[in-house]
């Protein structure tokens, strides 16, 4: 058993049929010695008396808020949560496996630049009695600070019969060094509590591996005289690291017909303009990627040819 | 060419070669994210690798103030990786495919390090750790780790030379 926060404790349970329960001794936080009684949750029934209460925690029915009282007055609370371990593996019932980029990916994170700011998100089908708490650091043995905000519900989607909820959190490395080569990964730890179930999820990454620039901005077409060619121009996204002479992007320009089956013409360039042939009803799209490190491409920025 | 003591390197040549290094490093090991090498424990490999750190002056401001600190650090790293790519980690079993980009990568590392330090001039180089994996699978894993680490290193080096070429060239 360990303390998650003040008056909240996590009991780690081996979850198999013939596992013995965990013996837990609760102590009432009071100088009083006599006349102390214990109750659980909303029930007013006395579960035991004395400054300590010894319980066996085996089921979610044994978890909950234990309260000690004296003469009708509440003295202290202890909320017990359960963390299940099945076949030696901690349960992952609360979050959905996003399966990208690999199985057992519960947390996904992205950064728009090298500033040390990143966003992580996760999915769940649970809509109520759910809380998250996020901590992060650079490295784990001698951790350097990363500050994370509160996790918030960022999207709701209907997936078949189920509703899916997306939560996200923004974090910022306290002393980021955008130009340095990272040697220690960022660690992100999410504590998830659903009713009386506790779970924790972790992700470890280098900022360089989660970079995904915003799409190029100000995408414009300039027709070339007496030609079906156009000059496409764009700019670096505002959110990208500066100076651009140092933090350079490379771009992919694509001409795509109306039909998805039509052949796509693609051009790669380090410049912020390109000359392409604009077909009728086609659209021109541009996306960006770090020039020197193959992390994710940005989403496409698009304009119609006409 | 970078001459120890203060003169500037051939920024544009260094830029072109370092960008080529980036391309080669990624073609040698393109599996981004498919194998999480950090799960395999990096202690013996990457702890000894020379990283370009915050105080090495490789940021735009540091380069403007005095690019020599950064260039020396890059040179150290290039020599380190060049030795690693020439070691039995890459020459031993399992053999690399004949058209593997590792050979070109090795040559380009040497080429860029020579651009930075002509014959007869010596910067302090870092001792290469004695890594001699016994099993072919260990060697394979080590190659992946080294190439992943090299990708990060050459990306920073390429940024330095691109910025130098754009802002510090005579």
């Amino acid at each position: 058993i360990w303390e998650l926060k003040k008056d909240v404790y996590v009991v780690e349970l081996d979850w198999y049929p013939d596992a013995p329960g965990e013996m837990v001794v609760l102590t009432c936080d009071t100088p009083e010695e006599d006349g102390i009684t214990w109750t659980l949750d909303q029930s007013s029934e006395v579960l035991g008396s004395g400054k300590t209460l010894t319980i066996q925690v085996k089921e979610f029915g044994d978890a909950g808020q234990y309260t000690c009282h004296k003469g009708g007055e509440v003295l202290s609370h202890s909320l017990l949560l359960l963390h299940k371990k099945e076949d030696g593996i901690w349960s992952t019932d609360i979050l959905k496996d996003q399966k990208e980029p690999k199985n057992k990916t519960f947390l996904r994170c992205e950064a728009k630049n090298y500033s040390g700011r990143f966003t992580c998100w996760w999915l769940t089908t649970i809509s109520t009695d759910l809380t998250f708490s996020v901590k992060s650091s650079r490295g784990s043995s001698d951790p350097q600070g990363v500050t994370c905000g509160a996790a918030t519900l960022s999207a709701e989607r209907v997936r078949g019969d189920n509703k899916e909820y997306e939560y996200s959190v923004e974090c910022q490395e306290d002393s980021a060094c955008p130009a340095a080569e990272e040697s220690l990964p960022i660690e992100v730890m999410v504590d998830a509590v659903h009713k009386l179930k506790y779970e924790n999820y972790t992700s470890s990454f280098f900022i360089r591996d989660i970079i995904k620039p915003d799409p190029p901005k100000n995408l414009q077409l300039k027709p070339l005289k007496n030609s079906r060619q156009v000059e496409v121009s764009w700019e670096y996204p505002d959110t990208w690291s500066t100076p651009h002479s140092y933090f350079s992007l490379t771009f992919c320009v694509q001409v795509q017909g109306k039909s998805k089956r039509e052949k796509k013409d693609r051009v790669f360039t380090d410049k912020t303009s390109a000359t392409v042939i604009c077909r009728k009803n086609a659209s021109i799209s541009v996306r960006a990627q770090d020039r020197y490190y193959s992390s994710s491409w940005s989403e496409w920025a698009s304009v119609p040819c006409s | 060419r970078a001459v120890p003591g203060g003169s500037s390197p051939a920024w544009t040549q260094c830029q072109q070669l370092s960008q080529k290094l980036c391309t080669l490093a990624w073609s040698a090991h393109p599996l981004v994210g498919h194998m999480d090498l950090r799960e395999e424990g990096d202690e013996e490999t990457t702890n000894d690798v020379p990283h370009i750190q915050c105080g090495d002056g490789c940021d735009p401001q540091g380069l403007r103030d005095n690019s020599q600190f950064c260039l020396q650090r890059i040179h150290q790293g290039l020599i380190f990786y060049e030795k690693l790519l020439g070691s039995d980690i890459f020459t031993g079993e399992p053999s690399l495919l004949p058209d593997s980009p590792v050979g070109q990568l090795h040559a380009s590392l040497l080429g860029l390090s020579q651009l930075l330090q002509p014959e007869g001039h010596h910067w302090e180089t870092q001792q290469i750790p004695s890594l001699s994996p016994s099993q072919p699978w260990q060697r394979l894993l080590l190659r992946f780790k080294i190439l992943r680490s090299l990708q990060a290193f050459v990306a920073v080096a390429a940024r330095v030379f691109a910025h130098g070429a754009a802002t510090l060239s005579p």
């Epitope: 329960g21 659980l40 029915g61 | -």
Partner: antibody, heavy 119, light 107 residues
């Protein structure tokens, strides 16, 4: 006052189905799991299983799994034990009981339902 | 599953005497053992839990002791209403199991 009131005695034929009930009152129904115990004529007590009234989480004795089904209706604070096809060997007194949280034993018992299966 | 063996199977005693019933487990159940009393035609009633804690409303003449595999229920001075069948139950490991019972009869 805590009370578990069980449905009346049943006489059934082999192969018939049956559902007996146990209505709880006088306490917070969702805080306490409900269990069932069998006592065959002239025999001792046998633990059938327990169930959570919150989410219907169930722990069956392997000996009874597939033979009986436990269920619960939160809205009426009632637990059920049912058979889809009774056998003569199901003849027994069935008790519902309240599981004490933080322990696991049964602190309050229903009066019992006698089930007789005979052709 | 854990087997609980009670002894004796039948105990004959007189009111005012001390009665001791033993319960032995086939493997350790820590202190997670309860005792119940059952009178003819009635449901069992909880007496002792966690090996030695008296259920509220149970007279002080009933006491429990033991841990691990050996447990004892003691009635210090028998009253006429104490003559009944007594069961021990372990609730450490599923499936929870009961002893076969001890009949306490008037000598």
């Amino acid at each position: 006052e805590v009370q578990l009131v069980q449905s009346g005695a049943e006489v059934k034929k082999p192969g018939e189905s049956l559902k007996i009930s146990c209505q709880s009152s006088g306490y917070s129904f969702t805080t306490y799991w409900i269990g069932w115990v069998r006592q065959m004529p002239g025999q001792g007590l046998e633990w059938i299983g327990i169930m959570s009234p919150v989410d219907s989480d169930i722990r069956y004795n392997p000996m009874f799994r597939g033979q009986v089904t436990m269920s619960v209706d939160k809205s009426s604070s009632t637990a059920y034990l049912q058979w889809s096809s009774l056998k003569a060997s199901d003849t027994a007194m069935y008790y519902c009981a309240r599981r004490r949280p933080g322990q696991g034993y049964f602190d309050f018992w229903g009066q019992g339902t006698m089930v007789t299966v005979s052709s | 599953e854990i087997v609980l063996t009670q002894s004796p199977a039948t105990l004959s005693a007189s009111p005012g005497e001390r009665a001791t019933i033993s319960c032995r487990a086939s493997q350790s159940v820590s202190s997670w053992l309860a005792w119940y009393q059952q009178k003819p035609g009635q449901a069992p009633r909880s007496l002792i839990y966690a090996a030695s804690n008296r259920q509220s409303g149970i007279p002080a003449r009933f006491s429990g002791s033991g841990s691990g595999t050996d447990f004892t229920l003691t009635i210090s001075s028998l009253e006429p209403e104490d003559f009944a069948v007594y069961y021990c139950q372990q609730y450490n490991i599923y499936p929870y199991t009961f002893g076969q019972g001890t009949r306490l009869e008037i000598k």
